[in-house]
């Protein structure tokens, strides 16, 4: 069975979060996709969405968020550039499918942004997380206002955390520290 999980990214201010959400391309290739933040006790808030219908590998930029939907691969790429401490939180990708509720994608992203000079020689931030180049064309898309009332808005209690990093090289990748945590619905 598919497990809903969280992956934790610990980044410094100014860095770029660069992640992907996969979906069943036969079902959702041209559906509108969105990037949402889930704040404790609140409804998920849509921060950016693709066009409707979603265009293949056509970057959409909303502020510091860039979405790129690779239809033919069933992948939505999400980049949040120039991260700020206030960006810390729980994020998810969803697929809009009116009149039905949005379809939530795996995995959720727990983003922790800390203050600190990024890209110092010898630090573990010497990676593509620092680097961002603006796509040649960007467009803004209007996002539907509705969100799913049934979306879980609480992080799992600390006791359920299952830090699955059996092979220690995950901490040596310079991507970030990523912790996988099952979320129980």
């Amino acid at each position: 069975a598919t497990k809903l999980t969280e992956e934790k990214y610990e980044l410094k201010e100014g860095q770029t979060l660069d992640v992907k959400c996969d979906y069943t391309l036969e079902k959702f290739a041209s559906s509108q996709k969105a990037w949402q933040i889930i704040r404790d006790g609140e409804m998920p808030k849509t921060l950016a969405c693709t066009e409707r219908p979603s265009k293949n590998s056509h970057p959409v930029q909303v502020g510091r968020i860039i979405l790129e939907d690779y239809h033919d691969h069933g992948l939505l790429r999400v980049r949040m550039v120039n991260l700020q401490v206030e960006d810390s939180g729980l994020y998810q990708c969803v697929i809009y499918q009116p009149p039905k509720e949005p379809h939530m994608l795996f995995d959720r992203i727990r983003l922790v942004v800390t203050k600190g000079f990024s890209g110092t020689p010898g630090s573990n931030e010497n990676s593509t997380q620092n680097v961002y180049k603006i796509p040649p064309t960007t467009t803004k898309a209007l996002c539907p206002l509705y969100t799913s009332p049934r979306t879980v808005t609480q992080a799992p209690p600390k006791s359920t955390a299952d830090v699955s990093t059996p092979d220690s090289e995950i901490n040596l990748t310079n991507v970030t520290d990523i912790i996988r945590v099952p979320v129980f619905n």
């Epitope: 691969h73 961002y132 092979d167 990748t173 991507v175």
Partner: antibody
Amino acid sequence: QVQLVQSGAEVKKPGASVKVSCKASGYTFTSYDINWVRQATGQGLEWMGWMNPNSGNSGSVKKFRDRVTMTRNTSISTAYMELSSLRSEDTAVYYCVRLIGYSSAWKWSFQHWGQGTLVTVSS
Amino acid sequence: DIQMTQSPSSLSASVGDRVTITCQASRDISKYLNWYQQKPGKAPKLQIYDASNLETGVPSRFSGSGSGTDFTFTISSLQPEDIATYYCQHYDNIPITFGQGTRLEIK
């Protein structure tokens, strides 16, 4: 340690299908995408596509899209790549590969490779 | 699709030599570039990721540099065990593509 062990060499006739298996050990199978890369004899590397073992979703490059199927059995930590309508130019070594970072990261660095499976297509 | 062009396609060098392989992308790929080493009959091995980061366990004589469209892979002092074919690979977008490879031989 991380290990990807692939099934043995196959000889197939043109038009047939082949299913290559890739058994993972030494890590949580559902936490990392599996990719497939092939290499024709004496040629370079060619990326075929990816699969997320947790969701079961997969994607492949255009030239293989109608012929390739990537699946998995999470209970035995095994990924599969099936290629149908084989032709002589599909003769190659097929590798399953695990990425460096967890499946949500845009980090397509091929860190752990299977030993390869030679598929020969000949009439 | 992004084309990756490696040069030279083959080179011969002596033990102790400094060896440089270049990889050029058909458009800006930032630092989304990896380098692999493949010995005959073996699977490739990741050597450098994100243009300049040395993979764990890879000797420090190997290094990578560059960003945008031009990248360099360097072996500071060639050793007999470095004889292999080296490939670059981008992941700036989908599809992922590899360079055609550079075959390195000992003089």
